[in-house]
Amino acid sequence: TRDVREPPALKYGIVLDAGSSHTSMFIYKWPADKENDTGIVGQHSSCDVPGGGISSYADNPSGASQSLVGCLEQALQDVPKERHAGTPLYLGATAGMRLLNLTNPEASTSVLMAVTHTLTQYPFDFRGARILSGQEEGVFGWVTANYLLENFIKYGWVGRWFRPRKGTLGAMDLGGASTQITFETTSPAEDRASEVQLHLYGQHYRVYTHSFLCYGRDQVLQRLLASALQTHGFHPCWPRGFSTQVLLGDVYQSPCTMAQRPQNFNSSARVSLSGSSDPHLCRDLVSGLFSFSSCPFSRCSFNGVFQPPVAGNFVAFSAFFYTVDFLRTSMGLPVATLQQLEAAAVNVCNQTWAQLQARVPGQRARLADYCAGAMFVQQLLSRGYGFDERAFGGVIFQKKAADTAVGWALGYMLNLTNLIPADPPGLRKGTDFS
C-alpha cells in the first residue's frame, strides 16, 4: 500500500452578471486543494434570469430582486447543501447600471439595495452587489479568456505546472451598453487611466484597457435610430419592407441619445419609420458614431482615447460573437477576413425584410437590427480599434472556452477566490490499482 490522493472536495462560487439587457447567473467550481493560490475554476452551471436587466427596474426596485429568485432557487439545487454556507455569492452590474447611476443615482442605489436584500435571504456567503467600473469589466474579461485558454499556467503531462511560452490573448467584449478592449502591452500607457498592472502566478503583466460607454450594441442601435430620425426620415440600416412606429420618448430616454435630442420634442409623439436597405448610407450613419478629429496622444483609437497599436491574438466575445455567428451560421457568409466581414455586412444590409425572414425562418425579434450590428462591428474593429487584415487574422470569435462562458464573471470570481482558504488535500491509506 501507499499514500493515494483522495479526489479533493469541490468548492463553489456564484456570480450574477447583471448586464444592461439581462442578468445571467454563473456557478463555478474548483478543487479545494488549489495550486498557486488560484483554483482550477470551471463553470458548473448557469441560469438566465428572465426579463430585462436590473437597470430596467429603476421604477420598481423590488421587481429587480424578484426577477433573480428563479435562478437563486436553481443555485440551491446546483450547489450541494453542505457547501451553501461556504459558497461566496457576488453580483456585479455593468454598463446598464453605470448609465442609470449617471442619470438617476437614487434609483441605482435603490435597485442595488433591493437586490442586496434578496441575496442576503439565501444561505450562501453573500459578499456584495456593486457596479463594476468599465476598467474592471475589461480586465476581468481578459483574465477569464487567458485563464480558460491556459495562457497563464498549465498542468504538464509530467505532473508539473509550467508557464506557457505563448503570449496572452487580447480580449474584446461587446455588451449591450458598453464595449471593452483589453490587451497586454510592453510600453507604458500614455494615459495612465488605461493601464492596469497585474500580478498573476508570480508573473507581472502590463495591460491596456478601455471601456467605451454608449458603444454597446443596444445603445449603438438606439443612437443610430435617433440619427436616422434626425437626418433621413427613414432608416438606411433597416431592411426595406420593415416599418415601425416609434415613441420619441423611448428614443431619447437614454443618456447615450441625449446629445441627439431635439430641443422641443414631444416625448409622447409617435413617428413612423421605415427601412430602406441602403448599405452605403448605413455605413455613413455608423461612421458618425466615431470621431477621429482630435487626439491628445501619439495615437488614438477614436474619440480622443489613447490606444497602443493592437498586438497579438484576440478573442472577441458576447455580441461580437453573436453578430459574427449570425453572419456565418444564419446567413452562410464567410467572415475570415476584414474584407469578407465588410462584404457580409453589405450583404445583410442589402436584404429586404421578406428576404431576411425567408433566410432566417421563425425569428422575428431583432432580425431588423443585424445589418446595423454587423456594420458597427466591422467599423469598430477596422476604423475604431485599427485592426488591419493581418491583425484581424488573429481574432477569434468565441462564446465559450473549456465549457465556460467567456466574459468578465469568471475573472471576477478568480480575483476573489484568493480570499477563500483551501482545504488541505485528504490523504488516505489505500491501494492504487492503476
Epitope: 444592461s20 439587457s21 439581462h22 428572465p50 426579463g51 430585462g52 436587466g53 437597470s55 430596467s56 446598464g96 448609465l99 449591450g176 451598453a177 443596444d218 445603445q219 442601435l221 438606439q222 435610430l225 426595406r240 419592407g241 420593415f242 416599418s243 415601425t244 412606429q245 416609434v246 415613441l247 423611448d250 428614443v251 430616454q253 437614454s254 413612423s272 419609420l273 421605415s274 429586404t352 425584410w353 421578406a354 425572414q357 425562418p361 421563425g362 425569428q363 422575428r364 425579434a365 431583432r366 431588423a368
Partner: antibody, heavy 129, light 111 residues
Framework: QVQLQESGPGLVKPSQTLSLTCTVS?????????WNWIRQHPGKGLEWMGY???????NYNPSLKNRITISRDTSKNQFSLKLSSVTAADTAVYYC??????????????????????WGQGTTVTVSS | DTQMTQSPSSLSVSVGDRATITCKAS??????????MNWYQQKPGKAPKLLIY???NLESGVPSRFSGSGSGTDFTLTISSVQPEDFATYYC?????????FGGGTKLEIK
Amino acid sequence: QVQLQESGPGLVKPSQTLSLTCTVSGYSITSGYYWNWIRQHPGKGLEWMGYISYDADNNYNPSLKNRITISRDTSKNQFSLKLSSVTAADTAVYYCAGGYYRYGLGSYSGSYYYVMDYWGQGTTVTVSS
Amino acid sequence: DTQMTQSPSSLSVSVGDRATITCKASQSVDYEGHSYMNWYQQKPGKAPKLLIYAASNLESGVPSRFSGSGSGTDFTLTISSVQPEDFATYYCQQSNEDPPTFGGGTKLEIK
C-alpha cells in the same frame, strides 16, 4: 380614423376557393402597416393566416402556405384573401387587421413588438355543400 | 410553432373583484431581455382590441386597472377591479417568432 371592413360570400362549397376583400379607409395601405388576415374557428381561439406589407411583401402561416394568397389593389385601397381547396375545417369568422412593429424600450435596449391594433368587424364564412 | 395555453378557459367574477388570467408559452417568448407578449380583449360580435404589448405596456386609452406581467414562458393579465364593461374574452399572443400565435382565450363572466 383608420377603419377596415371585410366583404365576400358567406357560403363557399368544399374544394372551391374562398375569396374575401378588406377595404381600408382613413389610411393608405402603401404608407405603412402590415395588412393581416386572422380567423377564428367556432368556439376557438384566433389563428394568424398571413399578411401583405405596405411594400407588397407577403408572409404566410406555414400551415396554410400552399393554399393561401394575399394580394392588394392600391387603386381601391383594398387587400384580398384567397384560400383554395377549402373544407369544413375552414369554416370560421375571418378578420382583416392592420399590424405594425412598435418600437419599445426596456432595460436600455429597444426592440420591436408586432401588434395588430386596427381590426375589421369580421365576416362569417361557412364551408358547406 | 409556439403554442400558447391560457387558463382558466372561463372565469366568473363579481364587479369590483380582482381577475387574473394566465398564459403559458410552449417555449420562451423572451429574446435579449424583451418579452414579446401581447394581450387582446374581444367582446361578443366585436373585433379584438389591443390592451397590452411587450408583456406589461398598456396601450394608450386602456384603463390603468389592466396590467400585465411575466417573462419567459409565464405571463399574467390582471384586472385589479373588474368593471361591467370588462366582461369579454381575453387572448394572449406572442410575436417573438413566426408565425404569431394566440392563446385559446379566457372568457370573463359575471358571477
